[in-house]
């Protein structure tokens, strides 16, 4: 038997992926466990194998279909179960009725690129990945810029309160190396959270022209 406190958290990427993390204090490391997804009004169900990510937590991705296919709607409720093998039987360790569009975490933005760079400013664009057409333009973004000698945690957050897939960074220092990241969140969903940060985009501002006041 497995005792201790259990936490089972899942997020839907709005298209065809549910990612889950199960934490269990005192769980047995060698136990084979899986997540089972059973939608209330669909003909399919899906399973993924929980793999350890730390001493007492496991994660897996339920792949529901092609990455850009709309596999669940706002009306769907999915019963999610953690099942662990005990001898020849499967034991239910955790269960939840999951409303996918109340528990959203989108994929990190992709295809970051410098559109235009000057001495003091830089225009950067990006794309969102595997985001449902349901959201229309109702998304928000956070961005941050890593300056020399600072950490990501120290970088101030810039908020874009609409679906704007570009930003113009101002008041930069000439001839300086920076890094930039962005993340996205839909307005929809009580338990919705920010996407992971994008891969950092490195760029360098242009040097100030010689003899010019900077």
């Amino acid at each position: 038997a497995v005792n201790g406190t259990s936490q089972f958290t899942c997020f839907y990427n709005s298209r065809a992926n549910i990612s889950c993390v199960w934490s269990q204090d005192g769980a047995l490391q060698d136990t084979s466990c899986q997540v089972h997804a059973w939608p209330d009004r669909r003909r399919w169900n899906q399973t993924c194998e929980l793999l350890p990510v730390s001493q007492a937590s496991w994660a897996c991705n339920l792949i529901l279909g092609a990455p850009d296919s709309q596999k669940l709607t706002t009306v769907d409720i999915v019963t999610l179960r953690v099942l662990c093998r005990e001898g020849v039987r499967w034991r239910v360790m955790a269960i939840q009725d999951f409303k996918p569009f109340e528990n959203l975490r989108l994929m990190a933005p992709i295809s970051l690129q410098v559109v235009h760079v000057e001495t003091h400013r830089c225009n950067i664009s990006w794309e969102i990945s595997q985001a449902s057409h349901y959201f229309e333009r109702h998304l928000e973004f956070e961005a941050r810029t890593l300056s020399p000698g600072h950490t990501w945690e120290e970088a101030p957050l810039l908020t874009l309160k609409q679906k704007q897939e570009w930003i113009c960074l101002e008041t930069l220092t000439p001839d300086t190396q920076y890094e930039f990241q962005v993340r996205v969140k839909p307005l929809q969903g009580e338990f919705t959270t920010w996407s992971p940060w994008s891969q950092p985009l490195a760029f360098r501002t242009k040097p100030a022209a010689l003899g010019k006041d900077t």
Partner: antibody, heavy 117, light 107 residues
């Protein structure tokens, strides 16, 4: 500019079927949801259902499920709502609207349907 | 089915004054509440989504707030074009339902 233009007023007898069209422009119809809402004099606004043109799925409100059919023709960017077995309480203005599933961002001008013997 | 109750049914306010419209849900709906304005002979127009997020192009005098299952639409300084019927709508549980409306009239 986003536009939804609905077909004209209809007068129908009880038991008949009405089919209303909604021609859209100014956005990608194939990636949109088109909804239908009834506004009857005594009943207020009622959400009838929607069609998801990308997924090819429909969703109907339980109160209309047995009598309503929502379809779309992506070649003409037109959505349709068919209501059958009409009764006097179906006398109402019917709106098509565009939006995500949760709220309605743009509306058609409405189509008045009168059911009378 | 979630029942949305709006109050008052009719609200009489003078131009330039503040109007406060209320909408209560019969069960918890998180922030899944949206507001519309409808003028006579016209289709409804979306004003506010998720309880408090203003829609682009809607004047800043329109604002929304939430306390539990009670939602409020506030119009800070009424203009002549604001006199209309206002509906709330929940999107927490399908079928999504509307309130019966509050008619805002000139005092």
């Amino acid at each position: 500019e986003v536009q939804l233009v609905q077909s004209g007023a209809e007068v129908k007898k009880p038991g008949a079927t009405v089919k209303i069209s909604c021609k859209v422009s100014g956005f990608n119809f194939k990636e949109s949801l088109i909804h239908w809402v009834q506004q009857a004099p005594g009943k207020g606004l009622e959400w009838m259902g929607w069609i998801d043109n990308e997924a090819g799925e429909t969703e109907y409100a339980p109160g209309f499920q047995d009598r309503v059919t929502i379809t779309a023709d992506t070649s003409t960017d037109t959505a349709y709502m068919e209501l059958s077995s009409l009764r006097s309480e179906d006398t109402a203005v019917y709106y098509c609207a565009r939006g995500g599933p949760w709220f309605l961002s743009y509306w058609g001008q409405g189509t008045t349907v009168t059911v009378s013997s | 089915e979630i029942v949305m109750t709006q109050s008052p049914a009719t609200l009489s306010v003078s131009p330039g004054e503040r109007a406060t419209l209320s909408c209560r849900a019969s069960q918890i709906i998180s922030n899944n509440l949206h507001w519309y304005q409808q003028k006579p002979g016209q289709a409804p127009r979306l004003l506010i989504i998720y309880g408090l997020q203003s829609i682009s192009g809607i004047p800043a005098r329109f604002s929304g707030s939430r306390s539990g299952t009670e939602f409020t639409l506030t119009i800070s300084s009424l203009q002549s074009e604001d006199f209309a019927v206002y509906f709330c709508q929940q999107s927490n549980n399908w079928p999504y339902t509307f309130g019966q409306g509050t008619k805002l009239e000139i005092k």
